[in-house]
């Protein structure tokens, strides 16, 4: 997290706000609900209280405007700048302005007013932009999904550094951003994508370019807003320029940033029986046209060319790949080796000799 220079903050805990005007995109009630909910994000974790005024001057004046709207920080039409807010202080201090050239919504379409407002009110209270891609105060908008919003831990630490904690946090689960060099790090899924490596963990993935040591961390939804926050398995089919992503009993086919029409589909359409509730890992072999799927303690082989499960499957992981354990969290193939991830450990397995060559920490893939 980051706070503004000179640690700008309100010297009182009872703050007022006023909605000066409204966007035509939503009903008045939807706008009011979005702003109330956005303030609650911050009051839940601090001693701050927010009261709405219907007229007069409030600490935080909220308005919608377009282009030059009276503060010498003009908006720029659709997209780009969505909103801005001033840090705590007199006059403009604390005020939040929203660009009415955006389409404001209470869903995943356009820009979600609640999410943008919660971010802007963070500025109104003294938080600057965070470098943590999981933080609400990260400067890039990402729709985080329909489920109940949980303020990330980085934002909680930031706001409490200014105002301290509140009496009781009604939602004490604050998601942390994974640390790639945590020795206990386990991974959810790994796939290549057009020469890069995508390494999934929780609602994030690391993006590793070839010949590059520093992996970039992204929210999965910043790449693919329609995907679930967390995924179970992934693999690339390079000759078709597709990657396949699995979560529970569903899977998606993606071409770059775009989901193919007709997806998600059910994994039963690949030939899995209904007892299989999720795929834990998957890896595709371009030379043979086969894909291995791991679920529980079993491995399945799928023939991509004929689009059918191979006979004699499923088999036990321990029988086909002795020594790697009875489960696979994530897997990928490179230069004749399969890399199996099981908890914080990865196994380098030689396809030809059918032997484990090396055992390494899972996060050595991330250059830790």
């Amino acid at each position: 997290y980051n706070v503004f220079p000179r640690t700008l903050k309100w010297s009182k805990t009872n703050l007022t706000y006023r909605i000066v005007n409204y966007t035509p995109d939503l009903t008045h009630s939807e706008v009011e609900k979005a702003f109330k909910k956005a303030f609650k994000v911050w009051s839940d974790v601090t001693p701050l209280n927010f009261t709405r005024l219907h007229d007069g001057t409030a600490d935080i004046m909220i308005s919608f405007g377009t282009k030059e709207h009276g503060d010498f920080y003009p908006f720029d039409g659709p997209s780009g700048l969505l909103a801005h807010a001033f840090p705590p202080g007199p006059n403009y201090g604390g005020d939040a302005h929203f660009d009415d050239d955006e389409t404001w919504t209470s869903s995943s379409k356009g820009y979600n007013l609640f999410l943008v407002a919660a971010h802007e009110f963070g500025h109104s209270l003294g938080l600057d932009h965070s470098k943590d891609p999981g933080a609400l105060m990260f400067p890039i908008y990402t729709y985080t999904g329909k489920s109940h919003f949980m303020l990330p831990d980085d934002d909680v630490q930031g706001i409490q550094s200014l105002y301290g904690p509140g009496d009781e946090d009604p939602n004490p689960r604050h998601p942390k951003t994974p640390d790639k060099c945590d020795p206990s790090l386990s991974l959810d899924a790994i796939t290549s994508l057009r020469g890069e490596t995508m390494i999934f963990k929780d609602r994030f993935f690391w993006r590793l370019h070839p010949q590059q040591v520093d992996a970039e961390l992204f929210l999965t939804k910043s790449f693919w807003p329609e995907l679930p926050n967390r995924i179970d398995a992934a693999y690339e089919h390079p000759s078709r320029d597709l990657i396949f992503i699995f979560r529970g009993r569903k899977y998606w086919a993606l071409n770059g940033y775009d989901i193919l029409e007709g997806y998600p589909q059910k994994i039963s359409e690949l030939g899995f029986p209904k007892e299989v509730k999720k795929i834990s890992a998957a890896v595709h072999f371009e030379d043979t046209g086969k894909t291995l799927f791991f679920s529980g303690n079993q491995v399945w082989s799928y023939d991509d060319t004929n689009q059918i499960m191979d006979k004699d499957y499923p088999r036990l992981i321990e029988e086909d790949f002795p020594g790697i354990g009875d489960k696979v969290d994530a897997v990928y193939e490179k230069n004749g080796y399969i890399y199996f991830f099981n908890g914080p450990i990865q196994f380098e397995y030689n396809i030809w000799s059918k032997r484990i060559v090396r055992v390494m920490p899972a996060n050595s893939l991330l250059w830790c």
Partner: nanobody, 114 residues
């Protein structure tokens, strides 16, 4: 419905630069990812570069560090800046919005001679 028209192709010596443009008609351009693909004679069409709605970029390994993709949603235009061109970059370059099942331009020829 989005119509895409590429421009900026041409002939250039190895090591030279070109800037391709992709003009989109229709106000929905900003809702789609924008991609460049290319097809060399006798070869399959291949992905070159892509930029998401949120302006996250992605490049084929063969062009990374030489090509830069960008977009201007207000103008409804996408760009591909191609530097340090090589003879193997010779191809017809296609602009795409929305991926394989999305919208395609008719292409612009790029020829790089040694």
């Amino acid at each position: 419905e989005v119509q895409l028209v590429e421009s900026g192709g041409g002939s250039v010596q190895a090591g030279g630069s070109l800037r391709l443009s992709c003009a989109a008609s229709g106000s929905t351009f900003s809702r789609y990812s924008m991609n460049w693909y290319r097809q060399a004679p006798g070869k399959q069409r291949e992905f070159v570069a892509g930029i998401s709605v949120g302006r996250i970029t992605n490049y084929a390994v063969s062009v990374r560090g030489r090509f830069t993709i960008s977009r201007d949603n207000a103008e409804g235009t996408g760009y591909l800046q191609m530097n340090s061109l090589k003879p193997e970059d010779t191809a017809v370059y296609y602009c795409n919005a929305g991926g394989l099942q999305g919208y395609w331009g008719l292409g612009t020829q790029v020829t790089v001679s040694s």
